[in-house]
């Protein structure tokens, strides 16, 4: 296993839709063709797996149906959205990065993005 | 080293709008966000906001919603808070500060003085 | 709106003393996001601790933070001249972000 360096924004306001969009690259010693992608969420000492994705470079990122995340890919960079947060999602968000294929096998993680949530304000009450 | 420089101080008639810049250097200005904090003469200290650099997203104190505008350019590595019709209650030192990972206010403008006098 | 309430208003104390400072929030404040600053006449604000007992950088380790909930404290173990000053703490974990209203550790 070797180390890769994984960079990602230190602080992310998500939208008043409760959508956050981040930028994850990491600098990739070879050509790989298969990478893994994993969001990790940690907040209060608690660390906990968000969503994952393994694409094909080219591709585009195929997380699971019910996944909070969608994603694109672009070279080294991959653009990560989160949907459906609240204020008590805020926390810091890391980004973790597989060089799957080919070998040799490289591990990235960031230092992480602290998103931050605001829940809206209700809508006042209307007459209809 | 990281280094937030503001405008100088500013005089304003009761009605008027200010607009306060913070120039960044020593970062990477659009990965972080940008706070502004006010302190009367002889007061504590007040939060007014942030800015994520990042997508432009605002979070505003409620009591200053709908007079205040923050705004950034990353471009020039700077930070931008308009206060509009200014009242005298307004007269203060606005400082800005850097919203970092862990949320804190680790790095701060030297600060800058609005008086509001008619 | 979380209200910080700092206790006592005025701390007066000797160089070398123990200064003790409180914070309590009228709700929860996870302890993540809770900070302490020491402001000077003239100066800006600067964060002591950060995530309740993290200590920023090139912070002596006199200064330590503890707490959780609702009450939280600042401590100085052994007062320095430069010590003295007026402490807030912060918490922004809940929109809007709110201040203390302020500590002031004085010479006795």
């Known amino acids: 296993c070797k180390a890769m360096h994984v960079a990602q924004p230190a602080v992310v306001l998500a939208s008043s839709r409760g959508i956050a969009s981040f930028v994850c690259e990491y600098a990739s010693p070879g050509k790989a063709t298969e990478v893994r992608v994993t969001v990790l969420r940690q907040a209060d000492s608690q660390v906990t797996e968000v969503c994952a994705a393994t694409y094909m470079m080219g591709n585009e990122l195929t997380f699971l149906d019910d996944s909070i995340c969608t994603g694109t890919s672009s070279g080294n960079q991959v653009n990560l959205t989160i949907q459906g947060l609240r204020a008590m999602d805020t926390g810091l968000y890391i980004c973790k990065v597989e060089l799957m294929y080919p070998p040799p096998y490289y591990l990235g993680i960031g230092n992480g993005t602290q998103i931050y949530v605001i829940d809206p304000e209700p809508c006042p009450d209307s007459d209809f | 080293q990281v280094q937030l420089v503001q405008s100088g101080a500013e005089v304003k008639k009761p009605g008027a709008s200010v607009k306060v810049s913070c120039k960044a250097s020593?970062?990477?200005?659009?990965?972080?966000?940008i706070s502004w904090v006010r302190q009367a003469p002889g007061q504590g200290l007040e939060w007014m906001g942030w800015?994520?650099?990042?997508?432009?997203?605002?979070n505003y104190a409620q009591k200053l919603q709908g007079r205040v505008t923050m705004t950034t350019d990353t471009s020039t590595s700077t930070a931008y808070m308009e206060l509009r019709s200014l009242r005298s209650d307004d007269t203060a030192v606005y400082f800005c500060?850097?919203?970092?990972?862990?949320?804190?206010?680790?790095?701060w403008g030297q600060g800058t003085l609005v008086t509001v006098s008619s | 709106e979380i209200v910080l309430t700092q206790s006592p208003g005025t701390l007066s104390l000797s160089p070398g003393e123990r200064a003790t400072l409180s914070c309590r929030a009228s709700?929860?404040?996870?302890?993540?996001?809770l900070a302490w600053y020491q402001q000077k006449p003239g100066q800006a604000p600067r964060l002591l601790i950060y995530?309740?007992?993290s200590r920023a950088t090139g912070i002596p380790d006199r200064f330590s933070g503890s707490g959780s909930g609702t009450d939280f404290t600042l401590t100085i173990s052994r007062l320095e001249p430069e010590d003295f000053a007026v402490y807030y703490c912060?918490?922004?974990?809940?929109?809007?972000?709110?201040f203390g209203q302020g500590t002031k550790v004085e010479i006795k």
């Open positions: 709700q929860s404040v996870s302890s993540s996001y």
């Open positions: 800015i994520s650099a990042y997508n432009g997203n605002t």
């Open positions: 912060q918490q922004y974990g809940s929109s809007p972000w709110t």
């Open positions: 020593g970062y990477t200005f659009n990965s972080y966000g």
């Open positions: 500060a850097r919203v970092g990972r862990h949320l804190a206010f680790a790095y």
């Open positions: 995530g309740a007992s």
